[in-house]
Structure formats: C-alpha cells, structure tokens
Amino acid sequence: IWELKKDVYVVELDWYPDAPGEMVVLTCDTPEEDGITWTLDQSSEVLGSGKTLTIQVKEFGDAGQYTCHKGGEVLSHSLLLLHKKEDGIWSTDILKDQKEPKNKTFLRCEAKNYSGRFTCWWLTTISTDLTFSVKSSRGSSDPQGVTCGAATLSAERVRGDNKEYEYSVECQEDSACPAAEESLPIEVMVDAVHKLKYENYTSSFFIRDIIKPDPPKNLQLKPLKNSRQVEVSWEYPDTWSTPHSYFSLTFCVQVQGKSKREKKDRVFTDKTSATVICRKNASISVRAQDRYYSSSWSEWASVPCS
Amino acid sequence: RAVPGGSSPAWTQCQQLSQKLCTLAWSAHPLVGHMDLREEGDEETTNDVPHIQCGDGCDPQGLRDNSQFCLQRIHQGLIFYEKLLGSDIFTGEPSLLPDSPVGQLHASLLGLSQLLQPEGHHWETQQIPSLSPSQPWQRLLLRFKILRSLQAFVAVAARVFAHGAATLSP
C-alpha cells in the first residue's frame, strides 16, 4: 500500500481467482484513543472499533472510503483504491490502446517546436467518475523540472456504438535548451482513477522524436505566363522555432484531385516556393518536416488550383 | 577552416557535408526510429557519447559570440563517432554490406572533422569507451543505439553549419 495523495491510498493486488489479497491496517488520524468506530462509504454498518482497523483487501467491494467516527462526529477518512496486477502485468483498463506508433501506446505526445513545450493526449470510453493527474520530468535518476497543467477533456467522438473521449495536457520544460542535443528523455507519468480503480501510464521520449510542425502558412499561387505551371509559395508556421536559418524545415508539395487515387504531381524542396502543374478541380498542398531530423510531417496546408 | 587559433570554417562546405551526414545517418538505419531503444537499458552506451549541450555555445547567439567553442565540441563528436564506426562494433559480425551507407557515413564523418581541423592542429578529443560486445545480437543493438544517437548529434551539427553559412560566412 502507498499514499497517492493525502488520505488516498493505493493497494496493489495480484488479481487471480481466490487470491489472498492484502492485509491493510488503517489508523484514525486523531488524538482520541477510545470510542472510535469505522464505516465504509455510505453504509452505517460498523466494521470495527479502536484507533486502528485491520482489513483484508481482496476485491473492489473492499475498497472505498473508510471513515472513523466518535460519537457521531467524523474524525478522518482514508480512501482505498485498487491497482490490479494480472499475470505480473498492471491493468490498463481505463485508457484505450492507440496502437500508434506501436501496440501498448496509451499516451501520445507531440511538440510543435523545440521550445520544450509539448502536448500529450489519451483516449478512454469512460465518461464519469474519472480523474487524471500528470507529472513529468527530464530524466529519472536526477530529474529536471517539467511543469504540466491539468488534464482536460479535449474531444468527444462517436466510434461505432460507443463514445470515445480524448483528454489532453500541456507541459513545459522549466529550463529548455532548444539548440542542445537531448541526452536524457522526457518522462511523462499519468495517474488515472476510475471509481475505485487506480492505474498509471508512462511515456518516455526525446522532444526531437515527437516534433510535428504546424502546417506551412500563407500559401499563395502565381500562374506562370504561357504555361500550365504555377508557382506556389508559403511561409514557415508561426509556431516553429526561430531563427529559421538554424531551425530549418523541408517541404513536400503535392497537387492532387479530391480522391487519393487520382493522378498527382509531387516535389520535395528546402525552399519556400516550388513550381507545379495545376489541374482543374485539384488542390495544391504543402507540408513540412524538420530538415535535419526525420520526425513527423506536419498536416497539409491546401489551396484550390483554380 | 576552424583552427584552434580561431579562424572561420568553410561554412558552406561544412553545411553541405553535415546535411549529407544527416541523410546518411538515417539511411544507415532508417528503421531505428521504430525501435524503442530506451527499453533496452541505454545507460552504458549513450551516456558515454559526447552530446552537444546547453553550455557548448551551439545556439545562434553562442555562434555569433564565438563559434570556436561549438566547433570544437562538434569536432570532438565527429572524431568520437568516426572511431566508433570504424571499431569492432561495426566491423565485426554480423558484417555490414560492403556498400552500406555506414561506410559513406564513416568517410563523411572523417571528411567533416578534417574540414574543421586541418592537419597539424589539435583539439582535445574524448576517449572512446571500451565497448566490445561479445554476441552478434549485442553488437546489432549497439549499432542501432549508436546510429540513433548519431542522428541526433548530426542534426544539431547541421543546424549549426546551416546557420553559420547563412549568417556568419564572410
């Protein structure tokens, strides 16, 4: 058993049929010694008396809010949560496996630049009685500070018959050094509590590996004289690190119709302009990637050809 | 050329070669990005490699103030990785294809280090750790980790030279 926060405790249980469970001793936070009784949740049934209460925690029915009283007055509470371990593996029932970029990916994180600011998100089908708490650091043995905000519900989607909820959190490294080569990864830890179930999820990454620039901005087309060719130009996204002579991007320019199966024109360039062939009912799209490190491409920025 | 005395390097040449290094580092092991090597207990390998750190003057302001600190750090790293790529880790079994990008990568690391430090001038170089994996699978894992780390190192070096070529070239 360990303390998650004040008056909230996590009991770690090996979860299998007829498991013996864990013996837990609760102590009432009071100077009183006599006349103390214990109850669980809303029940008035007295579970025991005395300053301590010893219980055998085997299942969710044994978890919950234990309260010690004296003469009708509440002295203190202890909330017991369960953390299940099945076949040596901690349960991951609360969050959905996003399966990208690999199986068992519960947390996904992205950064728009090298400033040390990043966003992580996760998915669940649970809509109520759900809380998250996020901590982060650079490195684990001698951790350097990363400050994370509160996790918030950022999107709701209907997937087949059930709803899916996306939560996200923004974090900022306290003393970021955008130009340095990272040697210690960022660690992100998410505590998830659903009713009386506790689970924790972690992710470890370098900012450089989660970079995904915003799409290029200000796409403009200039038809070339006596030709079907068009000069397309664009600018670096505002959110990208500066100066651009140092933090350079490379671009992919594509001309395509509505369907992915349609014929297309495509060219890669380090410049902020390119010449392509425009067709009626097609769109010109441009996306960006770090020039020197193969992290994710941005989403496409698009303008119609006509 | 960047010599210990403090003259300027051939920024444009360094830019071209460092960008080539980036391409080669990813070609040498493109799939390394799909392996989570941190799960494999990284400490003994990548803690020993020279990283370009915050105080090394490789940020735009530091380069403007005095590029020598940064160039010396990059030079150290190039020599370090050049030695690693020429070591038993890469020459031993399982043997690399004769024409694998690792060969070009090795040559280009040497080429860039010589652009930065001509013959006869000497900057301090970092000792290479004695990493001699006994099993081929250990060697393979070590190669992945070294290349992964090299990808990050050459990305910073390429940014430095691109910025230098754009803003510090005479």
């Epitope: 079907r228 199966r261 014929k263 297309k264 024109d265 495509r266 060219v267 010449t275 067709r279 | 070609s27």
Partner: antibody, heavy 118, light 107 residues
Framework: EVQLQQSGADLVRSGASIKLSCTAS????????MHWVKQRPEQGLEWIGW????????EYAPKFQGKATMTADTSSNTAYLQLSSLTSEDTAVYYC???????????WGAGTTVTVSS | DIVLTQSPATLSVTPGDSVSLSCRAS??????LHWYQQKSHESPRLLIK???QSISGIPSRFSGYGSGTDFTLSINSVETEDFGRYFC?????????FGAGTKLELK
C-alpha cells in the same frame, strides 16, 4: 493488368513525318499522365514531354518543341506522338509511359523503333 | 537544365557481390531523384522513387539513399538477372533529365 501496347517498328525517309501510337489496357488513360521518352541506340534516355489526356494539356522539353506533337484520344484509350522533319538524329526507340505521378515513370510501353533512312 | 552524372560508366561484378552506383546532380535537387533498371532489349523499369522509397514488386536487395546532389543506388548481393543498365532521373525541375547510365556487367 496495366499495359501499354505500342505501334510496330517503322523505317521512314529523311524529311518525312511519323505518328506513333500507344494504346492502354487495364486502365483509363484519363486517370494518368502520358509521357514519351526517346532512347537512341546504345545511349541514354531523353524525356520528350507529357500529355494529360483528361484535358489535352501538354508540356514539352525545349529540345523537342517543334519536333514532337503529343495528342490523346480517350475514346480509343490511345496516346500519340507525331515526329516531323525526321533526320538521322531521330533514329531511336520511343517509349510511352503511363504515370500516376507526373514526374517519374512507373509503367513503360515496350517501345517503338524508328529508323530514319536518307 | 539539371545535369546528372553517373559513375562509374561500367561496373564489372560477380554474382553475390554488393555494389553501389553513384548519381551526382549539377545542383541541389532535394530527394527528387529516381532510379531505373534496363535489361538488354527491354524497357526500363522503376526501382526506387524519391531517392530512397521502395517500389512494390522490386526485390529488397535494391535500396537507394542520398539528398541534395549526391545519390547512391545499392544492390546487396547481385544476382544474374540484375545485369543491365541503371539510370537515375531528376524530377526537381523541368525538363526532366536522366543520367547517362551505369552498365552493370558480368566480370
């Protein structure tokens, strides 16, 4: 299966014109760009130009402007290359290509050998 | 026009050897470079697109890398069916141009 059937080899006199055909099967040429590429005996490849059969748009390499004319007939699913004022320099194999992407050549015809005699 | 220089002009190898073919552009072309194989009396066929992207149906022994001005096509353990000519082609700007080719022949 995507295939391109090119017209047979031809021997033509210097100064004459010739029209080569390239008929597609297994796909509709409107969904592709059609390119023509020239290869002289024991030599490299030269790009002549492309046509978008959907709208008739064409683009020629400067070297072939005035020498080559590309057309397409979507009803017969065929692209054509007409070469005029032939000289010995035009003796070559001419390949047609069908391309989903404009700038590289993924489906090649077998080629038509054109020999110009004086 | 962008000029592509291929080297060597001829490469004599034994089946089982691994080889690298080089293509150098007269100016930077990012990764807009494609490789073709042409066997004797056959049409060319696309091997690699955009410097390193593989093409379905092409054996995995063919790989490409490079960007800017220097590009390489590698054949890991040459097989007898690989003999022929190899061309690079740039798609960075019009007109599209090809290299003069490298002939891969039996030693």
């Amino acid at each position: 299966e995507v295939q391109l059937q090119q017209s047979g080899a031809d021997l033509v006199r210097s100064g004459a014109s010739i029209k080569l055909s390239c008929t597609a099967s297994g796909f509709n040429i409107k969904d592709y760009y059609m390119h023509w590429v020239k290869q002289r005996p024991e030599q490299g490849l030269e790009w002549i130009g492309w046509i978008d059969p959907e709208n008739g748009d064409t683009e020629y390499a400067p070297k072939f402007q005035g020498k080559a004319t590309m057309t397409a007939d979507t009803s017969s699913n065929t692209a054509y290359l007409q070469l005029s004022s032939l000289t010995s320099e035009d003796t070559a194999v001419y390949y047609c290509n069908a391309c989903k992407e404009l700038r590289y050549f993924d489906v090649w015809g077998a080629g038509t050998t054109v020999t110009v005699s004086s | 026009d962008i000029v592509l220089t291929q080297s060597p002009a001829t490469l004599s190898v034994t089946p089982g050897d691994s080889v690298s073919l080089s293509c150098r552009a007269s100016q930077s072309i990012s990764i807009n470079l494609h490789w073709y194989q042409q066997k004797s009396h056959e049409s060319p066929r696309l091997l690699i697109k955009f410097a390193s992207q593989s093409i379905s149906g092409i054996p995995s022994r063919f790989s490409g890398y490079g960007s800017g001005t220097d590009f390489t096509l590698s054949i890991n353990s040459v097989e007898t069916e690989d003999f022929g000519r190899y061309f690079c082609q740039q798609s960075n700007s019009w007109p599209l141009t090809f290299g003069a080719g490298t002939k891969l022949e039996l030693k």
